[in-house]
């Protein structure tokens, strides 16, 4: 079945942009001017997921790369990673659960909760130039709120 997708960038609530840090990691830092071109462009897709009033299941791929954000256990801890997939088969309506995030959108602020690990969220640190990670706390020091901007190709 066809999948509804869009191209976008994400910034955390402190306006830090997300950029690649090595082949399989994202980091968050403040960018200005021409440096904004470094920020990662996501292909966000509407996928199948569990029903909830305020949650919309999405997958977050990197545009024109065969990489998707996924959530797995590493050393018994829910961990965010970039996972390589076969581009012929992705995106698809029925994504494996590790690729699915419940998008919670309130007043134009977005949160991305792992479907695999409820109450764990895509997070950034207050500090500059730190990895994007999966965090198990909301409303604490770490940042779980993002804004989204469409990207024209």
């Amino acid at each position: 079945a066809p999948v509804r997708s869009l191209n976008c960038t994400l910034r955390d609530s402190q306006q830090k942009s997300l950029v690649m840090s090595g082949p399989y990691e994202l980091k968050a830092l403040h960018l200005q001017g021409q440096d904004m071109e470094q920020q990662v462009v996501f292909s966000m897709s509407f996928v199948q997921g569990e029903e909830s009033n305020d949650k919309i299941p999405v997958a977050l791929g990197l545009k024109e790369k065969n990489l998707y954000l996924s959530c797995v256990l590493k050393d018994d801890k829910p961990t965010l990673q970039l996972e390589s997939v076969d581009p012929k088969n992705y995106p698809k309506k029925k994504m494996e659960k590790r690729f699915v995030f419940n998008k919670i959108e309130i007043n134009n602020k977005l949160e991305f909760e792992s479907a695999q690990f409820p109450n764990w969220y895509i997070s950034t640190s207050q500090a500059e130039n730190m990895p994007v990670f999966l965090g198990g706390t909301k409303g604490g020091q770490d940042i779980t709120d993002f804004t989204m901007q469409f990207v024209s190709s």
Partner: antibody, heavy 119, light 108 residues
Framework: EVQLVESGGGLVQPGGSLRLSCTVS????????MSWVRQAPGKGLEWVGI???????YYASWAKGRFTISKDTSKNTVYLQMNSLRAEDTAVYYC?????????????WGQGTLVTVSS | DIVMTQSPSTLSASVGDRVTITCQAS??????LSWYQQKPGKAPKLLIY???TLASGVPSRFSGSGSGAEFTLTISSLQPDDFATYYC??????????FGQGTKLEIK
């Protein structure tokens, strides 16, 4: 305050073209998807299509090929280009804002603009 | 494409009545269903989304239920302002978004 204002409707001959505009205020087109929905006189609502970023547009099966949605974020305006118009395209055309990305429902609507296709 | 079928097409009722409108999808759409109210010459107004969540500013006499392929909109006690046409809408289900044909709620 969120506002959507459609314009560009009017009388057009069968086979002709028309471009509708929807100018928005109170929010940014860089963060919200916009849809067009039409309503023939005395009939029900019919979804036309939706635009996210400029490369991500989706259409009702009947609209593909004849209707094109685009936008100019700097002008806060969404467009509906309609070609090869037929009498059955006569309707009030509404633009509407998607409530949340991929929610598929629409929380704000314009007042509508009437398109009449007749010779 | 998924087809949405509403029943009844027309419903006559009185102020204070409890009324129910049904919407059936031609296949399962999970809870991806919304309800709208439209008055003559006006744009539709979002009442309920995700089958049961009340949109902002909508009175609590409106409620929605159902999942899969069967959905209902209930108005617990009709007010004069509620006489209008009501539409269900499939909001998920892949690419296509589809509306029901509408239910006209008129004064008995």
């Amino acid at each position: 305050e969120v506002q959507l204002v459609e314009s560009g409707g009017g009388l057009v001959q069968p086979g002709g073209s028309l471009r509708l505009s929807c100018t928005v205020s109170g929010f940014s087109l860089s963060s919200y998807a916009m849809s067009w929905v039409r309503q023939a006189p005395g009939k029900g609502l019919e979804w036309v299509g939706i635009i996210y970023d400029s490369a991500s547009t989706y259409y009702a099966s009947w609209a593909k090929g004849r209707f094109t949605i685009s936008k100019d974020t700097s002008k806060n305006t969404v467009y509906l280009q309609m070609n090869s118009l037929r009498a059955e395209d006569t309707a009030v055309y509404y633009c509407a804002r998607e409530r949340a990305i991929f929610s598929g429902d629409f929380d704000y609507w314009g007042q509508g603009t009437l398109v009449t296709v007749s010779s | 494409d998924i087809v949405m079928t509403q029943s009844p097409s027309t419903l006559s009722a009185s102020v204070g009545d409890r009324v129910t409108i049904t919407c059936q999808a031609s296949q399962s759409i999970s809870s991806y269903l919304s309800w709208y109210q439209q008055k003559p010459g006006k744009a539709p107004k979002l009442l309920i989304y995700r089958a049961s969540t009340l949109a902002s500013g909508v009175p609590s006499r409106f409620s929605g239920s159902g999942s899969g392929a069967e959905f209902t909109l209930t108005i617990s006690s009709l007010q004069p302002d509620d006489f209008a046409t009501y539409y269900c809408q499939n909001t998920g289900g892949g690419i296509n978004i589809a509306f029901g044909q509408g239910t006209k709620l008129e004064i008995k």
